[in-house]
Amino acid sequence: QKPSIGKCSVDIQQNRTKTTERPDLLNCPIYWQQVQEKCLLFSHTVNPWNNSLADCSTKESSLLLIQDKDELTRTQNLIHDKAISFWIGLNFSLSEKNWKWINGSFLSSNDLKITGDAKENSCVYISQTSVYSEYCSTEMKWICQKELTLVRNKVSPDSWL
């Protein structure tokens, strides 16, 4: 379910110098990029998949979960170089012999087309154009995601216009 965005209106007769509490506002933290209902953070450093997973956790976020092809395309559009790759929150579960998202769900066959081996110690990364599997020990960049959070900002009504 998509979070609702509170509407705001301004009473023109209201004293404009008065500081008012603005209704619910969807905000991404500084340095994070908003992509629809998510905030994404593209790392600058490189790490194995497990370390990338841990880094996202320390930021109160998770490795990127991709719901469908549209979301994949939107994310890939933010990758500005063909030569850069980013870990996402998908790896191969040997016990279940299937690709598994870090939230516990399994990859649907029509969600993403993964190029590469589906085997033990395989994790998934995305590039500007494709989705690949690679040894999880490989050190590369990664993408963390947060759901957009509701924040109450105290603002002057002037800044609403």
Partner: antibody, heavy 122, light 108 residues
Framework: QVQLVESGGGLVKPGGSLRLSCAAS????????MSWIRQAPGKGLEWVSY????????YYADSVKGRFTISRDNAKNSLYLQMNSLRAEDTAVYYC???????????????WGRGTLVTVSS | DIQLTQSPSSVSASVGDRVTITCRAS??????LAWYQQKPGKAPKLLIY???ALQSGVPSRFSGSGSGTDFTLTISSLQPEDFATYYC??????????FGGGTKVEIK
């Protein structure tokens, strides 16, 4: 200035050893996969070895496996190649190279040193 | 190991000519291919990566194309500084990262 400078080449007898060094400057060395690539006189390019940014992952070409050891010191911004049991066919210019934008194991080499010549001869 | 075969091994051309060099992989490598230029006594220089992406600072007369097993480097209008040897390189995730045998572009 972004650059790589190799050193340590020279003349060595078959069976001997050499240690090559590569000093990096002008970029965040600790974030990049680094490789050694060699070129025998008048011949083509041959990838020798790579090391991941942390040093945890290392690969070698079959032709040098068991004889060469790649290592790095991120605190010193330096890459090394320890070459043992050298053979005449190891004679080449050895280049230190950086991978393009830390792309995982797809290593496009966007920055190269000028190379250092290793000659193995009796 | 994946083998790369470049053709021709040498080509004679004049300034202003269009030059095409091909590289064939022994098995499919998607778009994981690079092209380098090397001049005598110098280190190689990256021209093209990911089969078709132009490396920063490289003139637009250089272009790359192809996917799978067949790749092409094209110099649309040869300049005096382009006379050199050109190498392709495959960069699939499993080493070794092999290079083609090289193509020497000479002055006609």
């Amino acid at each position: 200035q972004v650059q790589l400078v190799e050193s340590g080449g020279g003349l060595v007898k078959p069976g001997g050893s050499l240690r090559l060094s590569c000093a990096a400057s002008g970029f965040t060395f600790s974030q990049y996969y680094m490789s050694w690539i060699r070129q025998a006189p008048g011949k083509g390019l041959e990838w020798v070895s790579y090391i991941s940014p942390s040093g945890a992952t290392i690969y070698y070409a079959d032709s040098v496996k068991g004889r060469f050891t790649i290592s790095r010191d991120n605190a010193k911004n330096s890459l090394y190649l320890q070459m043992n049991s050298l053979r005449a066919e190891d004679t080449a210019v050895y280049y230190c190279a950086r991978s393009l934008m830390a792309t995982g194991t797809h290593l496009y080499f966007d920055l190269w040193g000028r190379g250092t010549l290793v000659t193995v001869s009796s | 190991d994946i083998q790369l075969t470049q053709s021709p091994s040498s080509v004679s051309a004049s300034v202003g000519d269009r030059v095409t060099i091909t590289c064939r992989a022994s098995q499919g490598i998607s778009s994981w291919l690079a092209w380098y230029q090397q001049k005598p006594g110098k280190a190689p220089k990256l021209l093209i990566y990911a089969a078709s992406a132009l490396q920063s600072g490289v003139p637009s007369r250089f272009s790359g194309s192809g996917s799978g097993t067949d790749f092409t480097l094209t110099i649309s209008s040869l300049q005096p500084e382009d006379f050199a040897t050109y190498y392709c390189q495959q960069v699939t995730s499993a080493p070794p990262y092999t290079f083609g045998g090289g193509t020497k572009v000479e002055i006609k």
